[in-house]
Interface confidence: low
């Protein structure tokens, strides 16, 4: 029995619902009484949802899963996962048994966009060319871990003296803090770009230092 799932991971935003597609080709005369369907976590083999003996056996996964019962007879064994969390990320296997048996695994990639970075400067007054300043770029509640890039006003990448830390909160979302230590020129703009590698979403923050005063666009 051939079971088909998408090759590419299903990308779902945290808090939204995701559909993990799975289909099979029922033979003529097929009835749901013959169907055994199991969704499980590929790695741990934990049962997620099942259909057997003509009945939806329900969710074994925090009551957040559902089948499409009206579509099962047409060979649609897809699973709906509600209120996606970071912890849901991973591989789900769809097992279908009628007379023959088949299975396939689909990957769920969870994502959350990063907030617009906030920029802080230390010290933040009486700045002179030649002073060393610390610029902190903070962006919150994204997933997965971000890629952080710094550049100057001319678009030249700044890679030295950058320290980036990322810490997950209890939902598994990351807060990113990137610190750039730089020696001030006569004036300058420093930009931080926080990229979500899955969503290919960029969040920008910048600070312009003009001797005095400073501006935060």
């Amino acid at each position: 029995l051939e079971v088909q799932v998408p090759e590419d991971p299903v990308v779902a935003l945290v808090g939204t619902d995701a559909t993990l597609c799975c289909s099979f080709s029922p033979e003529p005369g097929f009835s749901l009484a013959q169907l055994n369907l199991i969704w499980q976590l590929t790695d741990t083999k934990q049962l997620v949802h099942s259909f057997a003996e003509g009945q939806d056996q329900g969710s074994a996964y925090a009551n957040r899963t559902a089948l499409f019962p009206d579509l099962l007879a047409q060979g649609n064994a897809s699973l709906r996962l509600q209120r996606v969390r970071v912890a849901d990320e991973g591989s789900f296997t769809c097992f279908v048994s009628i007379r023959d048996f088949g299975s396939a695994a689909v990957s769920l990639q969870v994502a959350a966009p990063y907030s617009k970075p906030s920029m802080t400067l230390e010290p933040n007054k009486d700045l002179r060319p030649g002073d060393t300043v610390t610029i902190t770029c903070s962006s919150y509640r994204g997933y997965p871990e971000a890629e952080v890039f710094w550049q100057d006003g001319q678009g030249v990448p700044l890679t030295g003296n950058v320290t980036t830390s990322q810490m997950a909160n209890e939902q598994g979302l990351f807060d990113v803090h990137s610190v750039l230590r730089v020696v001030l020129g006569a004036n300058g703009t420093y930009s931080c770009l926080v990229r979500n590698p899955v969503l290919q979403q960029d969040a920008h923050g910048s600070v312009t230092i003009t001797g005095q005063p400073m501006t935060f666009p």
């Epitope: 741990t44 830390s165 209890e170």
Partner: antibody, heavy 118, light 107 residues
């Protein structure tokens, strides 16, 4: 070297409050969560709660809500836990521990022994 | 809350032996499980996190395995310094909870 230095042992009377401290050195306090863990004599470990020093967000184990109050003083790189309305059940060693990215604990303080006795 | 059970409460083994300590979770914690050793009068020391990852400085004779609800910590070639209490801790969601501990004694 990353270290957490906790305040010394205390003996307090029932009904009183106590505030114990945990000074971080070798790293910046605000870069990591600070967690607190209770261990009663001869017993296992119980997570009390944690504080994110960057945003002062606090998560308590429901069991310790109303019993423990977590605070930080970023200027001195020090975290505090205040325990109130103490009873003999609160007699224990209290550890501070640095909450790593994945929420396990790599760096621990030596523990503060709190004894509640009249 | 997720309960972690560590049978047995104590075990003893001889130097050079291989010892396995187990931990069972009341619900799926995926691979979010850490192991600690606590020597008498000392703070706990992290041995394993994410079920099988050893932090820097932990001897390679320690190894962790398991996922979901069943986990184990294996100590190859037991040394005298390995005596103490061993605790598992899940780091899947708050409240983080610890197992009741397994006391390892050296014969």
């Amino acid at each position: 070297e990353v270290k957490l230095v906790e305040s010394g042992a205390v003996l307090v009377k029932p009904g009183a409050s106590v505030k114990i401290s945990c000074k971080a050195s070798g790293y910046t306090l605000s870069d990591f969560n600070m967690d607190w863990v209770k261990q009663s004599q001869g017993k296992s470990l119980e997570w009390v709660g944690d504080i994110n020093p960057n945003y002062d967000t606090i998560t308590y184990n429901q069991k310790f809500r109303g019993k423990a109050t977590l605070t930080v003083d970023r200027s001195s790189n020090t975290a505090y836990m205040e325990l109130r309305s103490l009873t003999s059940e609160d007699s224990a060693v209290y550890y501070c521990a640095r909450g790593e990215l994945g929420r396990y604990f790599y760096v621990w303080g030596a523990g503060t022994t709190v004894t509640v006795s009249s | 809350d997720i309960q972690l059970t560590q049978p047995p409460a104590s075990l003893s083994a001889s130097v050079g032996e291989t010892v396995t300590i187990t931990c069972r979770a009341s619900e799926n914690v995926y691979s979010y499980l850490a192991w600690y050793r606590q020597k008498q009068g000392r703070s706990p020391q992290l041995l394993v996190y994410n079920a099988k990852t050893l932090p820097e400085g932990v001897p390679s004779r320690f190894s962790g395995s398991g996922s979901g609800t069943q986990f184990s910590l294996k100590i190859n070639s037991l040394q005298t310094e390995d005596l103490g209490d061993y605790y598992c801790q899940h780091h899947y969601g708050t409240p983080w909870t610890f197992g009741g501990g397994t006391k390892l004694e050296i014969k």
